[in-house]
Amino acid sequence: SLLPVPYTEAASLSTGSTVTIKGRPLACFLNEPYLQVDFHTEMKEESDIVFHFQVCFGRRVVMNSREYGAWKQQVESKNMPFQDGQEFELSISVLPDKYQVMVNGQSSYTFDHRIKPEAVKMVQVWRDISLTKFNVSYLKR
Amino acid sequence: SLLPVPYTEAASLSTGSTVTIKGRPLACFLNEPYLQVDFHTEMKEESDIVFHFQVCFGRRVVMNSREYGAWKQQVESKNMPFQDGQEFELSISVLPDKYQVMVNGQSSYTFDHRIKPEAVKMVQVWRDISLTKFNVSYLKR
């Protein structure tokens, strides 16, 4: 069954945590649907964003942070492992110095920590996708 | 009650027709939600687009056409009559030489016909909105 989109969940992250998302683009790539995953510093959607991950399907991925209300330096990738019309599995792992983003089991993007991952309080998944799975796994100490 | 998004409906347009849409952005303007309305030449979403109207709430509006699979010259407007968090009523009227877009009763955008409005077979409303009303009215002859 489908999860609501935008999908918002409280989360605490640290090194070893992984966020897993399964979904499908709602439109063909020609129409440039988007997927966005935002790691927020508060439960409010207007809060700062520790890690902003936005896919324009078929075109590009941009990653950024929003600090004290201002977007910072954008990182862009043309790598496009997503398939038109196909379900995807996205996993974002918290490594000691960066986020590692896997798409369908393949390491596809990295983003250096700009803010401590421990500052994350909420994850939001939204834009032009249907969502079937959202999970945050924690490394067992 | 809410209509599904993306929302797709068969439509035939000509001078005097009006498409009316009521909805609400799904996110605060700081997060730049989008609204998109596309007038297609076929019932298929990958078909050409006679009139493409895309709002990046709080930032800008772009209008364009997609002909034989290729986007043409984009028209951009910084006019932003939409209100953060507020419901909007959008009406797109087919005038003899252009589309006129009204937002909450106020004339806000125009777009010259590049393709005959009679070529429209389907309207799609999508992206980051909840949709409560969609209507196509036809001028009584």
């Epitope: 942070s65 600090e67 910072k72 330096q73 110095d97 250096d112 920590h113 700009r114 401590k116 | -």
Partner: antibody, heavy 124, light 107 residues
């Protein structure tokens, strides 16, 4: 052992210019962001500027914006600081520093290697 | 821009524990780093990422942070630890900031 060796300091009149250089060795220079930090006589440390590993992104303390330019030549393993419109308050020892870790544009993990510094004196 | 505030001087008896604080940073978000500087020498990184020690730094140096305060702790202070200590913080995309420095006297 990582080495950072600054040069180019000296006495200059107010309004004058200087170009500092920092020769780096014994590490992969092109992989790390680099910074300049200064210390006025008898005072504390003040961060001046940072440049990312590729040289495409720079950041400056407000007091030097528009007057100082940080740059790097990865082929020569050298960091530069072009200082124009110098003021007496720019008088300091200028240290070249390497960022800790592989972060692309950051001093957030600290600066793990420092040069011995070069003295810049701005006086008439 | 934020300002980092340190006490100008801290004294500790030989073999006792010294704590130097650094206030004013958003240490819930950004890491604290600490440097030791002896007279006439360049600074040396002694703690990074709040609590990590570079190789070669004695175990008696440790760090922590909470809220707007970072703390450098020297357990069993030695005579050679008498130095100036500076905290530093900053984000990836913005300015780095140093505290004003603290002189540690070992009595």
């Amino acid at each position: 052992q990582v080495q950072l060796v600054e040069s180019g300091g000296g006495l200059v009149q107010p309004g004058g210019s200087l170009r500092l250089s920092c020769a780096a060795s014994e590490f992969t220079f092109s992989r790390y962001s680099m910074s300049w930090v200064r210390q006025a006589p008898g005072k504390g440390l003040e961060w001046v500027s940072t440049i990312n590993s590729g040289g495409g992104s720079t950041s400056y303390v407000d007091s030097v914006k528009g007057r100082f330019t940080i740059s790097r030549d990865n082929a020569k393993n050298t960091l530069y600081l072009q200082m124009n419109s110098l003021k007496p308050e720019d008088t300091a020892v200028y240290y070249c520093t390497k960022s800790q870790g592989g972060i692309s544009f950051s001093t957030q993990y600290g600066m793990d290697y420092w040069g011995k510094g070069t003295l810049v004196t701005v006086s008439s | 821009n934020f300002m980092l505030t340190q006490p100008s001087a801290v004294s500790v008896s030989l073999g006792q524990t010294a704590r130097i604080t650094c206030q004013g940073g958003n240490f819930g978000r950004y890491y604290a780093n600490w440097y030791q500087q002896k007279p006439g020498q360049a600074p040396v990184l002694v703690i990074y990422k709040d609590s990590e020690r570079p190789s070669g730094i004695p175990e008696r140096f440790s760090g922590s942070s909470s809220g707007d305060t970072a703390t450098l702790t020297i357990s069993g202070a030695q005579a050679e630890d008498e130095s100036d200590y500076y905290c530093q913080s900053g984000s990836v995309s913005d300015n780095a900031v140093f505290g004003g420095g603290t002189h540690l006297a070992v009595l």
